[in-house]
């Protein structure tokens, strides 16, 4: 009995420079090490304090990294993705997908639900508000009769 999980998905370009503690994060995923079911993408698993990513503050654990210096991370073996990061140089540009969970419920495996769907509360709240306004107006109208 899996409930529906809704996500607000945003993309961001993050430019980082390797400091003394490097970019300072770890990754999971790849075609040989799927982190999310039916998704071989590369995800941030850990951000190390004092690394460039932590000091910048925008990259978050759980973010999906879409590209590094313009190079797509689709369909890569895990170690190939790791090597691509390690060979990316001093200045590194990351295209990142943030997924903000906007509704909790009984959930199954992470990644279920429609990531591109409109969060259900964004529909229900206005509908509920409109219903209340209509009911109030109707009651006022009846009182005037």
């Amino acid at each position: 009995m899996n409930g529906r999980v809704d996500y607000l998905v945003t993309e961001e370009e993050i430019n980082l420079t390797r400091g003394p503690s490097g970019l300072g994060f770890n990754i999971v995923g790849g075609t040989d090490q799927q982190y999310v079911s039916n998704d071989s993408g590369i995800y941030v698993s850990r951000i190390k304090e004092n690394g460039a990513a932590a000091l910048d503050g925008r990259l978050q654990e759980g973010d999906k990294i879409l590209s590094v210096n313009g190079q797509d991370l689709k369909n890569l073996l895990h170690q190939d993705a790791v090597d691509l990061f390690r060979n990316a140089g001093y200045a590194v540009s990351l295209r990142v997908q943030h997924r903000l969970q906007v509704q909790n419920g009984p959930i199954g495996h992470r990644g279920e639900g429609d990531p591109s769907g409109i969060p259900i509360f964004m529909v229900l709240v206005p509908v509920f508000a409109l219903t209340m306004v209509a009911a109030w107006a109707f009651m006022r109208y009846r009182q005037q009769l």
Partner: nanobody
Framework: DVQLVESGGGLVQAGGSLRLSCVAS????????MGWFRQAPGKEREFVAA????????DYPDSVKGRFTISRDNAKNTVYLQMNGLKPEDTAVYYC???????????????????WGQGTQVTVS
């Protein structure tokens, strides 16, 4: 926390060999990439060798490539550094270090390692 203890250092003549060992405890050894660094008096800490969590990937600087070999035994929670053709300039304190697997930074970034041993002295005469 992970504890690292090095051993195997000593005094050796130029051209000789030594095998350093580093035993890890307190963590899941197979989840860590392992590295060796060295520091000579008055010099900065220098990357010597590294091996990934599975043993399938290694890296060395040009200064030791072909002379030093890093290996690991995950069953024994131990990483080794086989040093052949030793030179006087290899004299230093050798440190074992570990960092969580699948880090995105090159092995030579000392600041990316989470845990360090106390070091073992290697002197080449």
């Amino acid at each position: 926390d992970v504890q690292l203890v090095e051993s195997g250092g000593g005094l050796v003549q130029a051209g000789g060999s030594l095998r350093l060992s580093c035993v890890a405890s307190g963590g899941t050894f197979s989840s860590y990439d392992m590295g060796w660094f060295r520091q000579a008096p008055g010099k900065e800490r220098e990357f010597v060798a590294a091996i990934n969590w599975s043993g399938g990937s290694t890296d060395y600087p040009d200064s030791v490539k072909g002379r030093f070999t890093i290996s690991r035994d995950n069953a024994k929670n131990t990483v080794y550094l086989q040093m052949n053709g030793l030179k006087p300039e290899d004299t230093a304190v050798y440190y074992c270090a570990s960092r969580w697997r699948s880090g995105v930074d090159p092995y030579y970034y000392a600041g990316t390692y989470d845990y360090w041993g106390q070091g073992t002295q290697v002197t080449v005469s």
